[in-house]
């Protein structure tokens, strides 16, 4: 398998972060625009596939490694391109409250994709 | 301005174990995770990272029965455990950091030798 | 594990000269690979991230292109500074990998 051999961040994890990272904020990363993302189309691929644009942003680098660890767990992550709003474009702090929302809608149902 | 200053050398036998050191200066230690990687016949290998700020780690599977990540937070220090060293660790090992680009290391520390022979 | 080839082990340059080194990763990476320099006796220096963006202090000489599985890390009008290896990184997916590198030397 081509994943790291720790456990991944479980979904409780991801949550935490993301929550940790959007509470009481109303920006992220200077207000920096990313693509927006069909969540539901591999949402932890998706959401990579927009974030990992952003840099210089310490704030939400664990968020990305996270991704990016549950991403690599998934048969051929790295060929499946997910569907991407190429024409809209929203803050970072967005779509992470965006991807908040689906992953504890996922989490809720136990739907562990 | 971001340093990583690494131990010295080491010269072990066969079996053995080292630990290698990486102390970190510049930066707030718990912001950013600290990164191993093996130089060996010119080629590089991530061995994986450890994130100071919760002790969390993630392993190239190559590595994962060879090279253990610990920090001392107290000391703004990383450390690499190596173990059961054979004639095949014999490389330069680097610790850095990725502040910019998540991931892409972009300050290294100046590499420690570790040569395993009897 | 996302391989990544640098199918050119050697290339032999003159200063002054434009010289185009490539990187092909085996799975799509979208734009995440990154660019190192090293020279003899040093540790890897960065040089480009997200394929395209240069580190501050990083000569504008230095160009890097390409997204998906085609990358190229560009060096117009070559210094002698310039000559040393370069290696590629994927940070898309973990492992992160890189490639066995390019040395580049005077013709």
């Known amino acids: 398998s081509p994943s790291p051999v720790t456990p991944s961040p479980t979904l409780k994890e991801l949550i935490e972060e993301l929550v940790n990272i959007t509470q009481n904020q109303a920006s992220l990363c200077n207000g920096s625009m990313v693509w927006s993302v069909n969540l539901t189309a591999g949402m932890y691929c998706a959401a990579l596939e927009s974030l990992i644009n952003v840099s210089d942003c310490s704030a939400i680098q664990r968020t990305q490694r996270m991704l990016k660890a549950l991403c690599s767990q998934k048969p051929a992550a790295g060929q499946i391109s997910s569907e991407r709003s190429r024409d809209t474009k929203i803050e970072v702090i967005q779509l992470v409250k965006n991807l908040l929302t689906y992953v504890r809608g996922v989490y809720r149902h136990g739907n562990f994709r | 301005e971001v340093q990583l200053q690494q131990s010295g050398p080491e010269l072990v036998k066969p079996g053995a174990s080292v630990k290698v050191s990486c102390k970190t200066s510049?930066?707030?230690?718990?912001?950013?995770?600290i990164y191993w990687v093996r130089q060996s016949h010119e080629s590089l290998e991530w061995i994986g990272y450890i994130d100071p700020y919760n002790g969390g780690t993630t392993y190239n599977q190559n590595f994962k029965d060879k090279a253990t990540l610990t920090v001392d937070k107290s000391s703004s220090t990383a450390f690499m455990h190596l173990n059961s060293l054979t004639s095949e660790d014999s490389a330069v090992y680097f610790c850095?950091?990725?502040?910019?680009?998540?991931?892409?290391?972009?300050?290294w520390g100046q590499g420690t030798s570790v040569t395993v022979s009897s | 594990d996302i391989v990544l080839t640098q199918s050119q082990k050697f290339m032999s340059t003159s200063v002054g000269d434009r010289v185009s080194i490539t990187c092909k990763a085996s799975?799509?990476?979208?734009?995440?690979v990154a660019w190192f320099q090293q020279k003899p006796g040093q540790s890897p220096k960065a040089l480009i991230y997200?394929?395209?963006n240069r580190y501050t202090g990083v000569p504008d000489h230095f160009t890097g292109s390409g997204s998906g599985t085609d990358f190229t890390l560009t060096i117009s009008n070559v210094q002698s500074e310039d000559l040393a290896d370069y290696f590629c990184?994927?940070?898309?997916?973990?492992?992160?990998?890189f490639g066995a590198g390019t040395k580049l030397e005077l013709k």
């Open positions: 799975q799509n990476v979208r734009n995440a």
């Open positions: 997200l394929a395209s």
């Open positions: 850095a950091t990725a502040v910019v680009a998540t991931d892409v290391m972009e300050n």
């Open positions: 990184l994927q940070h898309w997916n973990y492992p992160l990998t």
């Open positions: 510049g930066y707030s230690f718990t912001d950013y995770p």
